[in-house]
Amino acid sequence: AVNGTSQFTCFYNSRANISCVWSQDGALQDTSCQVHAWPDRRRWNQTCELLPVSQASWACNLILGAPDSQKLTTVDIVTLRVLCREGVRWRVMAIQDFKPFENLRLMAPISLQVVHVETHRCNISWEISQASHYFERHLEFEARTLSPGHTWEEAPLLTLKQKQEWICLETLTPDTQYEFQVRVKPLQGEFTTWSPWSQPLAFRTKPAALGKDT
């Protein structure tokens, strides 16, 4: 079906990956579709096969080069097409002129580690992955801590309005198991969104010393 509601959304990870999701109400699940990328000022083009992620939604990753290579800049425009096979020919189902640095979503932060832990506080660091050098220090972070008996959705968000790849969590309970996550977002880009949350880092605060107030 071509008359259902259709949405074609893509994000650039700032280095060498464009991730796309296409949804089409009424489209057949077994339809063979792909995303084609055609830059306006580069000699390469790239294709990826859309794979189903839900009843009416497909996704794929355009791998533009080595993970840390800078394949696009702020002046690039990439024409992105969804093409679906109909019999012996391909039909264009969706199209957009994609401005990479207006549609950023970075990779989740990696290498989370506990730098120092005490009874009431914990210092945690992390690294950003595959982030363009163009950003310099123009990044922000959000972090959250999972306390016992709560859900991630209930966890208050801690905002770091600068490129700070560490945090000191305070007012923690002694001898308690916690989990910690962080995500990153460039300040640039009209349609830029937060990265996925990092893998959770589990840690335990130290027990209070015997005979001392906690």
Epitope: F8, V92, M93, I95, D97
Partner: nanobody, 126 residues
Framework: QVQLVESGGGLVQAGGSLRLSCAAS????????MGWFRQAPGKEREFVAA????????VYVDSVKGRFTISRDNAKNTVYLQMNTLKPEDTAVYYC???????????????????WGQGTQVTVSS
């Protein structure tokens, strides 16, 4: 499938004007962008102009900017190409095309369009 019928072509002197029309029938509910292409003898078919479903976005090949105007009447399922200040190099068969593709680009190609008319001849004499 969508059926397209062009009209309005003909022989005109350089500097003159023509207005091409293209009437769509069939599965017109599936039409999004409508466009015009042209093909001169011995040359590849080239993009001329396109207009979005709502009519609020248009794009033209550089060589016709300021001379050609694309418009559409959704109630009549018709797209028009007003061609002014015609030049001998505008001589070609002009084709109307439609696409079901959702979205917009400034870089339309023949592959983006799935329904085509038979074409109408435009000849500009010097």
């Amino acid at each position: 499938q969508v059926q397209l019928v062009e009209s309005g072509g003909g022989l005109v002197q350089a500097g003159g004007s023509l207005r091409l029309s293209c009437a769509a029938s069939g599965r017109t509910f599936s039409i999004n962008t409508m466009g015009w292409f042209r093909q001169a003898p011995g040359k590849e078919r080239e993009f001329v102009a396109a207009i979005s479903r709502s009519g609020d976005s248009t794009v033209y090949v550089d060589s016709v900017k300021g001379r050609f105007t694309i418009s559409r009447d959704n109630a009549k399922n018709t797209v028009y190409l007003q061609m002014n200040t015609l030049k001998p190099e505008d001589t070609a068969v002009y084709y109307c095309a439609t696409t079901v593709a959702v979205g917009w680009t400034t870089r339309w190609s023949t592959i983006d369009f799935d329904s085509w008319g038979q074409g109408t001849q435009v000849t500009v004499s010097s």
